[in-house]
């Protein structure tokens, strides 16, 4: 079942909840409004004090003696006890037992390079959009789904990995982001900030959002995760902003009335499939799209990022639970899980729709618009 | 429900902390707001505590001037001034803010704690 | 900060007859998400406010119909399609579109 639009001719306006119907007084909260941060963001965006895990975009793959064309995943890496709040957005260290799994975290030292180089490369992710500058492609179709409304059973693994709560997702969920740019849905995972700071990954104009949704799919080019890593187009991500609205978002309420079996960190429990879709915005013709990285190292580059225009709404209360429930490694929250935003040196980020003709309602003043330069091949 | 400290009559230079207790939910899971409502005036919105991490945000015209804290262990937030001055002289009233990033309506009040600076 | 300003800021009242209060934004308080960051409440004479509308026009629980809210962006309206004896009391509008909250001067209704 589509969730129900609102504001679709604005650019990253208007959400989209779960249930049409309000509830009571006691669960219909404020909005909250997103903040303005530069870039690298600003002293409010940082952990505080006590410096918060992060997360990791991408999901590992099976040892190689495992079957070969096989997309189930293993859990990322743990992450290092947080602390110093400065710099969060490139900071992790090797893990000391010496085996292949990267130990990081989101603050203090030493840099994300250290633990792998591509996280100081020239196109990485997170970017803010500026939808006045983007670059309308009526090329851009909108995006195909298939497969994505789960029965129950089987049952989906949702763990806490100490720097997200990750859903993994079965064989079967195809994405196609354009004629033959074909990918399946690996996983999911979510980053978030902390009540009264905002924890998108991603920004708009600088303004951050509460929270974000990523959909992590591999392309159909490819059997291993590993092999597609770096390669332009190899993994794809579908994006979503989630902010405040007055209702309860049902769809997400079945994984958010989970989360305190898996508070503690590296803990896990099975969920009942369900409608994936109905975790992202409904309008799948209104997104911006460029050429990034993963967020989290190994920071690989040639990821497809699709953000959607359209926002998706939760309740205060269940942006409450997703903040404030899990917990990270060294007795600290797993909150303010996001990297900066990183530097487009020189990269145009496509519209799939005119963003930047008078529509955002956050507009500057009218500015000459970039060609469209993928014209969706 | 809400509710608070008894009034309080202080001289100009003493020290004050008032409090609000929360009952009948869950106290950490909301912020707490404080407003000001000087004598015969009207409201003031003062600032915000979320008690879960004691994250706060003050109007600019209280910062510096007052100092909010919280205990979610006994669901109780705190207003305090180190150096009270006369016209601090008002009614207090602490509310449960809805809201996640921004704060939002104030749907309980407390019965408010009149404060005297007078010397 | 925003700056809120109520009009009338006194409202005699006949008991059974509308009554209507306007309060104006500085700026507007329409978040992304299409909805308008304004509350109103009542504080009767004695007692603490108590909340009447939120989101501009949702009213909250257990406040009488005879109460509703209107409005967006810089512009709102509240209204009494009734008033009663006990509607008496000082009405303030309340923004939160900003991260510094702020209220209106006031509307001191009273029964004529």
């Known amino acids: 079942q589509r969730l129900p639009r609102m504001q679709e001719d604005s650019p990253l306006g208007g959400g989209s909840s779960g249930e049409d119907d309000p509830l009571g007084e006691e669960d219909l909260p404020s909005e909250e409004d997103s903040p303005r941060e530069e870039d690298p963001p600003g002293e409010e965006d940082l952990p505080g004090e006590e410096d918060l895990p992060g997360e990791e975009d991408l999901p590992e793959v099976k040892p190689k003696s495992e079957e070969e064309g096989s997309l189930k995943l293993e859990d990322l890496p743990t992450v290092e006890a947080p602390g110093d709040p400065q710099e969060p957005q490139n900071n992790a260290h090797r893990d000391k037992e010496g085996d292949d799994q990267s130990h990081w975290r989101y603050g203090g030292d030493p840099p994300w390079p250290r633990v792998s180089p591509a996280c100081a490369g020239r196109f990485q992710s997170p970017v803010d959009i500026r939808p006045q500058l983007a670059a309308f492609c009526p090329a851009l179709r909108p995006l195909e789904l298939l497969g994505f409304q789960l029965p129950p059973l089987p049952e989906l693994r949702l763990r806490n990995n100490g720097h997200s709560v990750q859903l993994t997702l079965p064989p079967g969920l195809e994405m196609a982001l354009g004629p033959g740019r074909e990918y399946r849905a690996l996983q999911l995972h979510l980053h978030w900030g902390a009540a009264g700071r905002p924890g998108s990954e991603h920004t708009v104009e600088g303004h951050r959002f509460p929270a974000e949704i990523h959909v992590v799919h591999l392309s159909t080019a490819f059997a291993r995760v590993d092999e597609a890593l770096g390669r332009p187009g190899g993994l794809a991500v579908l994006a979503a902003f989630l902010e405040e609205g007055p209702e309860e978002n049902s769809a997400y309420e079945q994984l958010l009335s989970r989360l305190e079996e898996i508070a503690e960190e590296g803990s896990e429990t099975q969920v009942p499939g369900l409608d994936i879709s109905a975790l992202l915005p409904s309008d799948f013709s209104r997104y911006f799209q460029y050429e990034g990285s993963l967020t989290t190292p190994p920071c690989a580059q040639g990821v497809i990022w699709t953000v959607f225009n359209q926002t998706v709404m939760l309740s205060a209360k269940q942006l409450h639970t997703l903040s404030d429930t899990l917990w990270g490694p060294g007795d600290s929250r797993l909150q303010l899980n996001f990297r900066a935003t990183q530097p487009l040196n020189g990269r145009v980020i496509e519209a799939s729709f005119p963003a930047g003709v008078d529509s955002s309602p956050r507009a500057a003043e009218p500015v000459q618009l970039n060609s469209c330069l993928a014209a969706g091949d | 429900e809400l509710v608070q400290s008894g009034a309080e009559v202080k001289k100009p230079g003493e020290s004050l902390k008032i409090s609000c207790k929360g009952s009948?939910?869950?106290?950490?899971?909301?912020?707490i707001g404080w407003v000001r409502q000087m004598p015969g005036k009207g409201l003031e919105w003062m600032g915000i505590?979320?008690?879960?991490?004691?994250?706060?945000r003050y109007s600019p015209s209280f910062q510096g001037q007052v100092t909010i804290s919280a205990d979610k262990s006994i669901s109780t937030a705190y207003l305090q001034w180190s150096s009270l001055k006369a016209s601090d002289t008002a009614m207090y009233y602490c509310?449960?803010?809805?809201?996640?990033?921004?704060?939002?309506?104030?749907?309980?009040w407390g019965q408010g704690t009149l404060v005297t600076v007078s010397s | 900060d925003i700056v809120m300003t109520q009009s009338p800021l006194s409202l005699p009242v006949t008991p059974g007859e509308p009554a209507s209060i306007s309060c104006r934004s500085s700026?507007?308080?329409?978040?992304?998400?299409?909805?308008?960051?304004l509350s109103w409440y009542l504080q009767k004479p004695g007692q603490s406010p108590q909340l009447l509308i939120y989101?501009?026009?949702n009213r909250a629980s257990g406040v009488p119909d005879r109460f509703s809210g209107s409005g967006s962006g810089t512009d709102f309206t509240l209204k009494i399609s009734r008033v009663e004896a006990e509607d008496v009391g000082v009405y303030y509008c309340?923004?939160?579109?900003?991260?510094?909250?702020?209220f209106g001067q006031g509307t001191k209704v009273e029964i004529k």
């Open positions: 009948g939910y869950s106290f950490s899971k909301y912020w």
């Open positions: 505590i979320y008690p879960t991490d004691s994250y706060t």
């Open positions: 309340h923004q939160y579109g900003d991260f510094s909250d702020t």
């Open positions: 700026q507007s308080l329409v978040h992304s998400n299409g909805y308008n960051y």
């Open positions: 509310a449960r803010t809805h809201g996640y990033y921004k704060n939002g309506r104030m749907d309980v």
């Open positions: 989101l501009g026009s």
